[in-house]
Interface confidence: medium
């Protein structure tokens, strides 16, 4: 049943990238607001984002706390402007979620490149290490730290004379391959959870860094970082 | 389908060393770590180590360090396990796992028996 | 290293009742727990990890739960096809560690 003139909330998707974590779901509100619970499996119902007209909620702060349990999230509708009124004991209509483990599920965002370095036949190339909203012990977790050796990186590198694609893979945040003296390359990177079963293993490919794009660089004889 | 198949039985003097292999098929064989478990008669599970299939890199149990050897051939998807100075107690029957997601062992070996006696 | 230890060493329950088998560790894995089933003679198979989640194929008659130190496996009606040795293990911190099992029989 339900309370009058309310509609249960449908469509409930989560939306997750590097544990940044939105529960979206529809109806847009007519005359009606809602509030979210999460819970763990085990656990009790934590309510969030109280009588609101949104359709979506940042569950972030609560997922953080152990990425690796499943959480099962509702979502209640109320009539606008009789939230604390109604008078009625009646339990106002509601939608479960899918159940969702940060851990497995959480999408891996766009990595960047944050420097390469050539010294003469050698290239070192750095992923940058994002952070997370992960915590422990009062400090933030990059995404390495939590994945360990979950997260991998793949290197896609070619010469800017031709589109031949090389790769290379590597379980830190750093590359070392070797290139032709006097070719300037191109770099992408993708992180990687090679075990994930699921859509979600890859991430988009980081934005091309080229070598050779700034002026006055001298790539033969010295060091060069390009930092964003 | 999933499948790591083990190599046979073996009985091995006290000193001496003993490989075991381990060859995986049905899955992206370097996107996964290759576990080894023992199991000694009548006795619990003993995590020995792992190693990536795609670096080679390894980890081994403290207890193991000195005598294990974890090795892997990406041409023919195999992982191998040498233990070196046997003794009697190494007597016990030796499992590849694979390393799921996450940290648990999802896939095992048939197992391998190695028997160490004079 | 990581003990932990299963408790009871053996248990023997009757079919279509209730089997609970409890694991400790010595100090916190989160939910850092996977639990295994092994049949005489056969490898171990995997049923729950992260503490509750049951493995692809694994019967719902089988469930995890628990958190910090304190698990518990549970097999809420026992077939004859469950009777095996069951495992605990931390894959929380390594050396991943095994608890020393415990024996299943039907009463």
């Known amino acids: 049943s339900g309370t009058t003139n309310t509609v249960a909330a449908y469509n409930l998707t989560w939306k997750s990238t590097n544990f940044k974590t939105i529960l979206e779901w529809e109806p847009k509100p007519i005359n009606q607001v809602y509030t979210v619970q999460i819970s763990t499996k085990s656990g009790d119902w934590k309510s969030k984002c109280f009588y609101t007209a949104d359709t979506e909620c940042d569950l972030t702060d609560e997922i953080v706390k152990d990425v690796k349990q499943t959480y099962l999230a509702r979502v209640f509708s109320y009539p606008a402007g009789h939230v604390e009124s109604t008078g009625s004991t009646e339990e106002p209509p509601y939608e479960n979620s899918p159940e969702f483990t940060p851990y497995l599920e959480t999408n891996l965002g766009q990595p960047t490149i944050q420097s390469f370095e050539q010294v003469g036949t050698k290239v070192n190339v750095t992923v940058q290490d994002e952070w997370t909203l992960v915590r422990r012990n009062d400090t933030f977790l990059s995404l390495r730290d939590v994945f360990g050796k979950d997260l991998i990186y793949t290197l896609y590198y070619w010469k800017s004379s031709s589109s031949g694609k090389k790769t290379a893979k590597t379980n830190t945040n750093e590359f070392l391959i070797d290139v032709d003296k006097g070719e300037n390359y191109c770099f992408s990177v993708q992180a990687v959870i090679p075990s994930r079963r699921t859509a979600n293993r890859k991430s988009t490919d980081s934005p091309v860094e080229c070598m050779g794009h700034e002026k006055g660089e001298s790539r033969e004889t010295g060091h060069h970082h390009h930092h964003h | 389908e999933v499948q790591l198949v083990q190599s046979g039985a073996e009985v091995k003097k006290p000193g001496a060393s003993v490989k075991v292999s381990c060859k995986a098929s049905g899955y992206s064989f370097t996107g996964y770590y290759m576990n080894w478990v023992r199991q000694a008669p009548g006795q619990g599970l003993e995590w020995m180590g792992e190693?990536?299939?795609?670096?080679?890199?390894?980890t081994y149990n403290q207890k193991f360090k000195a005598r294990v050897t974890m090795t892997v051939d990406q041409s023919t998807s195999t992982v191998y396990m040498e233990l070196s100075s046997l003794r009697s107690e190494d007597t016990a029957v030796y499992y590849c796992?694979?390393?799921?997601?996450?940290?648990?062992?999802?896939?095992w070996g048939q197992g391998t028996t190695v028997t160490v006696s004079s | 290293s990581i003990v932990m230890t299963q408790s009871p060493d053996s248990l023997a329950v009757s079919l279509g009742e209730r089997a609970t088998i409890n694991c400790k560790a010595s100090?916190?894995?989160?939910?850092?727990i996977a639990w295994y089933q092994q049949k005489p003679g056969q490898s171990p198979k995997l049923l729950i990890y992260?503490?509750?989640n049951r493995y692809t194929g694994v019967p719902d008659r089988f469930s995890g739960s628990g958190y910090g130190t304190d698990f518990t496996l549970t097999i809420s009606s026992l077939q004859a096809e469950d009777v095996a040795v069951y495992y605990c293990q931390q894959d929380y911190s390594s050396p991943w560690t095994f608890g020393g099992g415990t024996k299943v029989e039907i009463k």
């Open positions: 190693i990536n299939p795609s670096t080679g890199g390894s």
């Open positions: 100090q916190s894995v989160s939910n850092g």
């Open positions: 992260f503490a509750s």
């Open positions: 796992a694979r390393r799921e997601l996450g940290g648990p062992f999802g896939y």
